[in-house]
Structure formats: C-alpha cells, structure tokens
C-alpha cells in the first residue's frame, strides 16, 4: 500500500477554498479501505471506503471528503478559516483483505488573514 | 535502466535447498511501494508466482510453496533472495526475479532467468 | 486461488490476418473501489523473458505497438492483434493481479503459418 500526499505546502487566503489531496495506491484489490485525516495530530475525521463509496462526507470544520477512482482521496476545506492552518497527514489501511497501512507526508497550510493589518496586528502583539 | 539479474547454482540434489539470488541495479529496493518477486517457469512453459517481498519487508508466499519458501533481502547489496527447500524434480524450472509497483501492479522488469534442475 | 483459463492454446496465423486470443477468470477482476479491472497481458518471445503487452485489461504498455489492443472486464478478456507480423511469435500469458496468490494462465502458442 502506497500513500501519496499533496501540496507538501499550500497558502491560501482566508474566506477562500484548500485542496489536499491523498494518492492511495495498491497493486491487488481491496474490499474496504480505513482512510484518515489528521491536523497537527488530531483526528479530522476517519470514514472507510468500499464498493466505490466513503461511508463519511464530512471532515472536520468545513472539510469535505470525496473519493475518485481509481486512487483520489481529497479534503476539500470551504470556507478556509485561520484556525484551519497547520499540518495535515492522511493515512490508509487496506482493512480487508489483509491488513496493511500507510501514511503521506506532511501538508502545511497557511491560511493568510482577509486583512492583511489582521497579520501585521499579530506579530505587532508579541514584542521581540 | 531498472535491470534485475538471477544468480544461483544450475544444479540442485533432491531434499536438498534451492538458493537464489537476485541483484537489481538502476532502482533501491528499498523505495517505496515496490514488491519484489520471484516467478518461476516449468519446462512445459506454465508461469507459476512464488512471492514477494514488499519494500516494508513484509512477506507473501504462494500456499501452494509456502511450506518451502522463504524470500528475504540485503539492502546493503540491493539483493532479494529465495529458498525453496525439501526440492524434487518438480522444483526444475527456470526461476524469474521481477518487481511489480503500488501503482500498475503489473510485472515491469524481469531478469533474464536462471535455469535450475533438480536431480541426483 | 482464482484460475485463469486461455483460449485457444495453440493459434496459428498467417502474416497480416487478425489474431485473437481469449482469457477468462474464476471470478471477477473488476473492482468498484477503484473501477479497475486487475488483468494484464504478457508475450514471451522465445528465448527471452515476459514483456508487459497490455495493462488493466485494455491499457497499452509503452512502446507496445497500437497493432495489439485488450478489451473485457469482470471475468472474460480478449487480446487483439489487428495484423500479425512474424515478430509477433510467441507465447501470450494473461495473468491476475486481483489478489495473491498471482495467477497466469496456461499460455497461448502463437506461430506464423
């Protein structure tokens, strides 16, 4: 089983919509497939695939889950927040038939403010 | 170029252990996502999966052989090996090395083979 | 252990006629999770190893001439040469990939007439 991870980094604007996309890839069939997202360690959300279906659309905060055959697991977060930004590992589990899992590298998201006096006003806030 | 090269004695006595070894060169065989496999021939040309061993070191073994073989690597030498013990003459075959990807599943490379007999 | 079965076993053809070779499988290679069919064809031209013809059931390997196309899905396949060359000798071998153990079938013996 083989996992593949995109953007390794991705910036986005707050308001705007984040695509993070998971390649899983296997060279026999599975019956049911265990993914998994994860932000800074947290679990966003931990739906299975089988017969061509995500059992769960939804994925944290304004995150939603859609998988495209044959290898496409993507998150999609609309509307992006600033509490969005950190750093998002997707992992899969072939569950049947036999075990066997994987995990992507690291996407770092950074969500830029709406205002960018938002940003100024927080570094501004921790003096030096 | 991905080239995979069998290497191993020609010649086997009954009850006796097949050894064979198999070099890749142009590719790690510890990058992932990568299944490395020995395939073998009988002389009336049935192709016929042994196993293979995935880049994790995990295992997989044909039932029909399990009891027999064993395939392990040295990922100091970029090798795969295999063991076929207890060998009778049915074991005579040329022995094929491959790889096979997460992404395809298809049997890309192979080795040129290695013929070996088992007789007295 | 799912058991791959050719037809014909012997086929031979005559240079620039079509040739045609049948697969068929235990049970269904097709996967809705990935909406794939885990069957790939093989030529072994005498003398030498397997070559990648045909991927997935209908996918040409690179490099693979557009004379040779693959087609089915579930459990029966077929290989097309649209016109045999005297290259094109050999044995073809459908093998699965739906699940271990890996199985070929017995092979199909394609010599020029």
């Known amino acids: 089983l083989s996992v593949q991870q995109g953007p390794n980094l991705l910036q986005v604007r707050q308001g705007s919509q984040a695509t993070l996309v998971c390649q899983v890839d296997q060279a026999t069939a599975w019956e049911r497939l265990r993914v998994k997202w994860t932000k800074d360690g947290a679990i966003l959300c931990q739906p299975y695939i089988t017969n061509g279906s995500l059992s769960l659309g939804v994925c944290g905060p304004q995150g939603r889950l859609s998988w495209q055959a044959p290898s496409h697991l993507t998150l999609q977060l609309d509307p992006v927040s600033l509490n969005h930004s950190g750093a998002y590992v997707c992992w899969a589990a072939v569950e049947i038939p036999e075990l066997e899992e994987a995990e992507g590298n690291i996407t770092r998201l950074f969500v830029d403010p709406d205002d960018p006096t938002q940003n100024r006003n927080r570094i501004a806030s921790f003096p030096g | 170029q991905v080239q995979l090269q069998e290497s191993g004695p020609g010649l086997v006595k009954p009850s006796q252990t097949l050894s064979l070894t198999c070099t890749v060169s142009g590719f790690s065989i510890t990058t992932g996502g990568y299944y490395w496999n020995w395939i073998r021939q009988h002389p009336g040309k049935k192709l016929e999966w042994i196993g293979y061993i995935y880049t994790s070191g995990r295992t997989s073994y044909n039932p029909s052989l399990k009891s027999r073989v064993t395939i392990s690597r040295d990922t100091s030498k970029n090798q795969f090996s295999l063991k076929l013990s207890s060998v009778t003459a049915a074991d005579t075959a040329v022995y094929y090395c491959?790889?096979?990807?997460?992404?395809?599943?298809?049997?890309?490379?192979w080795g040129q083979g290695t013929l070996v007999t088992v007789s007295s | 252990d799912i058991v791959m079965t050719q037809t014909p076993l012997s086929l031979p053809v005559t240079p620039g006629e079509p040739a045609s070779i049948s697969c068929r499988s235990s049970?269904?290679?097709?996967?809705?999770?990935?909406?794939?069919?885990?069957l790939d064809w093989y030529l072994q031209k005498p003398g030498q190893s397997p070559q990648l013809l045909i991927y997935?059931?209908?996918y040409r390997a690179s490099g693979v001439p557009d004379r040779f196309s693959g087609s089915g899905s579930g459990t029966d396949f077929t290989l097309k040469i649209s016109r045999v060359e005297a290259e094109d000798v050999g044995v073809y071998y459908c093998?699965?990939?739906?699940?271990?153990?890996?199985?070929f079938g017995q092979g199909t013996r394609l010599e020029i007439k």
């Open positions: 093998q699965q990939h739906y699940e271990t153990p890996l199985t």
């Open positions: 491959a790889d096979m990807a997460d992404k395809g599943g298809w049997f890309a490379y």
């Open positions: 049970q269904s290679l097709f996967s809705s999770n990935t909406k794939r069919n885990y």
């Open positions: 997935h059931a209908s």
